[in-house]
Amino acid sequence: GSERTCCPVNWVEHERSCYWFSRSGKAWADADNYCRLEDAHLVVVTSWEEQKFVQHHIGPVNTWMGLHDQNGPWKWVDGTDYETGFKNWRPEQPDDWYGHGLGGGEDCAHFTDDGRWNDDVCQRPYRWVCETELDKASQEPPLL
């Protein structure tokens, strides 16, 4: 069947999700495409516990997550509600800063060196994290 019952090779399982941590950089859209071709998505952080898990694996390195406001409001790539969900922005962020001189503002979110979030220019080549959920069908205990 098409169910994913265990994580692919080189992915890390945590709380019924699988995570893959890049060691090279891409622009946000290209990182997003990479994850999608793995039948996954850029990581969606839904709790402090998940934040700490991801932070532990990426270390103090700028790393893309699946959060952007390229079409106006902030949105998670998997449809998770942003307004009511977990957030971990740095103070004064997001600020949609235009002073970088690269044109436009800042529409893509990343983990900073201390794990808190910042919005930045989507073209910057940061590392990224892919996430895919283990299928609900595989979460049910086997019948005895």
Epitope: S2, R4, P8, N10, S22, R23, S24, G25, K26, A27, D30, N33, Y34, R36, L37, E38, D39, P125
Partner: antibody
């Protein structure tokens, strides 16, 4: 043996349709994104399309978008390319290729190709 | 999309020669660069991935270098079986997985 084998090529009139197949063996087919790459006679390689391992994501070159559809049947270890509204410039050898992803992406396995000729 | 160019488009060389082929990207692609070899009537074959990593089974006379926008494929001592066309491919901004036009290596 690890291999890819394309089929379904042939002569078709402009505006016609054709479906190519690529049979995979020797590896866990559903674990890999798969590509179609084409090569017009005497020309270079042109990437055409890619589909993720479980079929959830697809991408196309601008030159074929809206005319070609990539799909796969993992139960049959087979990749497909449905080609509609064919044009003379689609004449090429079509290769399927397996994508390896380890941060850096590359195509480590290719089929031998199948020739598609679009002509009246 | 990122544009890829290769030079020269063709070259003539002798057995034992050191051959160098250059690939250039229209913007930085870090090390997301692969090299393929294709012989007439055959499918392409992966030689080098990630700019400098040699694919399993590929002779050590092939090597790749470079990062950013400029890359090089070197054949340290050309052998008879190396006469072919060589293509570079970027996978930084992808898809599309863009190929360069290729370099044909033939016998002098």
């Amino acid at each position: 043996e690890v291999q890819l084998l394309e089929s379904g090529g042939g002569l078709v009139q402009p505006g016609g349709s054709l479906r190519l197949s690529c049979a995979a063996s020797g590896f866990t087919f559903s674990s890999y994104a798969m590509n179609w790459v084409r090569q017009a006679p005497g020309k270079g390689l042109e990437w055409v399309s890619v589909i993720s391992g479980r079929g959830g994501s697809t991408y196309y070159a601008d030159s074929v978008k809206g005319r070609f559809t990539i799909s796969r049947d993992n139960s049959k270890n087979t990749l497909y390319l449905q080609m509609n509204s064919l044009r003379a410039e689609d004449t090429a050898v079509y290769y399927c290729a397996k994508r390896i992803a380890a941060g850096m992406e590359y195509f480590d396995l290719w089929g031998r190709g199948t020739l598609v000729t679009v002509s009246s | 999309d990122i544009q890829m160019t290769q030079s020269p488009s063709s070259l003539s060389a002798s057995i034992g020669d050191r051959v160098t082929i250059t690939c250039r990207a229209s913007q930085s692609i870090s090390s997301y660069l692969n090299w393929y070899q294709q012989k007439p009537g055959k499918a392409p074959k992966l030689l080098i991935f990630a700019a400098s990593s040699l694919q399993n089974g590929v002779p050590s006379r092939f090597s790749g270098s470079g990062s950013g926008t400029d890359f090089t494929l070197t054949i340290s001592s050309l052998q008879p079986e190396d006469f072919a066309t060589y293509y570079c491919q970027q996978t930084y901004s992808s898809p599309p997985f863009t190929f360069a036009p290729g370099t044909k290596v033939d016998i002098k």
